[in-house]
Interface confidence: low
């Protein structure tokens, strides 16, 4: 632990002015693991003037950073790049004349205290005023800056020409697109100082490439993947004062695929589990031994989980018998195409053949998370209809 500091497993505390520290505290190798440090408190360190780019990076778990009543003059732009957990920063009563929002733009700070610094009035610190105004809480900091006449001006009153928040305008087409197709998004940004423009595509899977000039740009997304349906694409304008973004949501239409269809499993109902992907939502139709299965309250499709364009569910059968054994085919359709898959189901042996008995269902209330999704009409004659499972068991309970 550096001289003038005390260290524990999670804290570094440097408040002794003599001899004091001249550089940001660093832990010796083989001492405390810097990743476990969550708080650094520094006070009365008049010779601590700079936070360099690599001074803080080892403290990846750092949540609170306090440097007060010290000589801090300069903070490197990327000083906190690795400190994504930082929530509270207190730089009260230091020697900062300027501070860029680039230091903090990637952080989700709940507190940034800058009181008592000799800021120079310029566009460079206008972002602090904007931040203060956005907070609009009663405990707003009393911040000042020195103008050209070395006069203290409240930051709240600071007016600087050609120094404002930028704007971003995404001229998005209707962002509903068919899988495999391509789209181009155009965005224009404006502001003074002239903002930089960039695209935030998150975890977009589809191939994309941007062409960006200072104030206009286009983003080309090709061979669009169904995995990108529901994703957000943003155009961001950023300057010294702050940033603005305009966003659109991408909807991808694609033909259904049945990604999972398994043999029945028994819980408090029998379930033929399936997963279907498709957008718009596919209509589902079951066939039993080649004929349309007419659903009822005893045999019906249940969707348990919907994950945007993916549907997980069951063909639910109440108390099926040997009469329900056979081939079950699921067909999923929408306007872009259809898919089908088939499984063989064996619920129980024929009477007199020892192949297991009708399962004994526990008395559990089944929670229905969805509704039947089949909306293809029944146009078949019913001579091949699946036998109903509407039977009463030995205990008189109806299933």
């Amino acid at each position: 632990c550096p001289t003038s500091c005390k260290c524990s497993a999670s804290r570094i505390w440097c408040s002794d002015p003599s001899p004091g520290i001249v550089a940001f505290p660093r832990l010796e190798p083989n001492s405390v693991d810097p990743e476990n440090i969550t708080e650094i408190f520094i006070a009365n360190q008049k010779r601590l003037e700079i936070i360099n780019e690599d001074d803080v990076e080892a403290y990846v778990g750092l949540r609170n950073l306090t440097i007060v009543d010290s000589g801090l003059k300069f903070v490197a732009h990327k000083a906190f790049l690795k400190n994504s957990n930082l929530q509270h920063i207190n730089f009260t009563r230091n020697k900062l004349t300027s501070l860029s929002r680039k230091h903090f733009r990637h952080l989700d700070l709940s507190e940034l205290i800058l009181v008592g610094n000799p800021f120079t009035c310029s566009c460079d610190i206008m972002w602090i005023k904007t931040l203060q105004e956005a907070k609009s809480s009663p405990d707003t900091q009393d911040l000042y800056c020195l103008n050209e006449s070395s006069k203290n001006i409240p930051l709240a009153n600071l007016q600087i020409p050609n120094c404002g928040l930028p704007s971003a305008n995404l001229a998005a087409p209707n962002l509903t697109v068919e899988e495999g197709k391509s789209i181009t998004l155009s965005c224009s940004v404006a502001g003074d100082p002239v903002p930089n423009m960039y695209w935030d595509v998150g975890n977009l899977v589809s191939k994309h490439m941007n062409e960006t000039s200072h104030t206009q740009g286009s983003l080309r997304i090709t061979n669009i993947s169904s995995d990108d349906s529901g994703k957000q694409i943003s155009c961001v304008a950023e300057n010294l004062v702050g940033e603005d973004q305009d966003s659109v949501n991408l909807t991808v239409h694609f033909a259904p695929t049945i990604t999972f269809l398994e043999s029945p499993t028994s819980d408090h109902h029998w379930c033929i589990p399936f997963t279907v992907k498709g957008n718009p939502k596919p209509a589902l139709q079951w066939f039993y031994n080649g004929a349309i299965l007419n659903e009822s309250k005893y045999i019906c499709t249940k969707i348990h989980v919907t994950n945007h364009t993916e549907y997980h569910g069951c063909l639910q059968l109440d108390n099926p018998t040997h009469m329900n054994n056979g081939d079950y085919t699921l067909i999923a359709k929408n306007e872009y195409g259809k898919d089908e898959k088939q499984i063989s189901a064996h619920f129980m042996g024929w009477p007199g053949i020892d192949d297991g008995a009708n399962p004994n269902y526990p008395d559990v209330i089944y929670e229905d998370y969805g509704t039947a999704a089949n909306d293809i009409g029944d146009t078949t004659n019913r001579s091949n209809e699946i036998p109903s499972t509407d039977v009463t068991d030995k205990t008189g309970r109806e299933h």
């Epitope: 490439m209 000039s213 104030t215």
Partner: antibody, heavy 118, light 112 residues
Framework: QVQLQQSGPELVKPGASVKISCKAS????????MNWVKQRPGQGLEWIGR????????NYNGKFKGKATLTADKSSSTAYMQLTSLTSVDSGVYFC???????????WGQGTTLTVSS | NIVLTQSPASLAVSLGQRATISCRAS??????????MHWYQQKPGQPPKLLIY???NLESGVPARFSGSGSRTDFTLTIDPVEADDAATYYC??????????FGGGTKLEIK
Amino acid sequence: QVQLQQSGPELVKPGASVKISCKASGYTFSSSWMNWVKQRPGQGLEWIGRIYPGDGHTNYNGKFKGKATLTADKSSSTAYMQLTSLTSVDSGVYFCARSGYGYGFDCWGQGTTLTVSS
Amino acid sequence: NIVLTQSPASLAVSLGQRATISCRASESVDNYGNSLMHWYQQKPGQPPKLLIYLASNLESGVPARFSGSGSRTDFTLTIDPVEADDAATYYCQQNNEDPPWTFGGGTKLEIK
């Protein structure tokens, strides 16, 4: 379809200037970069620079800074390249080319032959 | 600036055979998950024509006998099978993030 039509051949004297034009059609002129490329007789291709007609933003190959000036007129969908203080080394064929997806130059003008001779 | 070195400078290939042209970049041209390398064909008296964009994507209207491969610094243009009409000079070009953008020195393909 996308087309780039360049102005005709130029024969100029050393020290003079010339302005070559490239008229675009078949696409939104203001939203694609326009590039300029030089080819000396029997030689390879050299990228001179590009302009974004939407806002006039330019990038230049350092070798051509001060030699070439790129401009664009949105109203006529025409890009221009002015070459100044011409010498014999400036002789060659100059192409305009549109940046397509991924910046590949997907459409080229037919080329303008510049001859600098006294 | 990124320097592109093409090899060979010229090659002669029999009709129906395979032609392979290499392009090596002095540093990586990969960006945004794409390789910003393109291939062009130029015949005498004509402007270049885009064949392959982003290393491996066939420009529309270009015959499927042209293909591109590679990433980072090493790229290849393959023509298989070669036809008489393919006699031309072929250039690679990189468009990595910051201009200036550069072309390879060219490879002259002759059909035997």
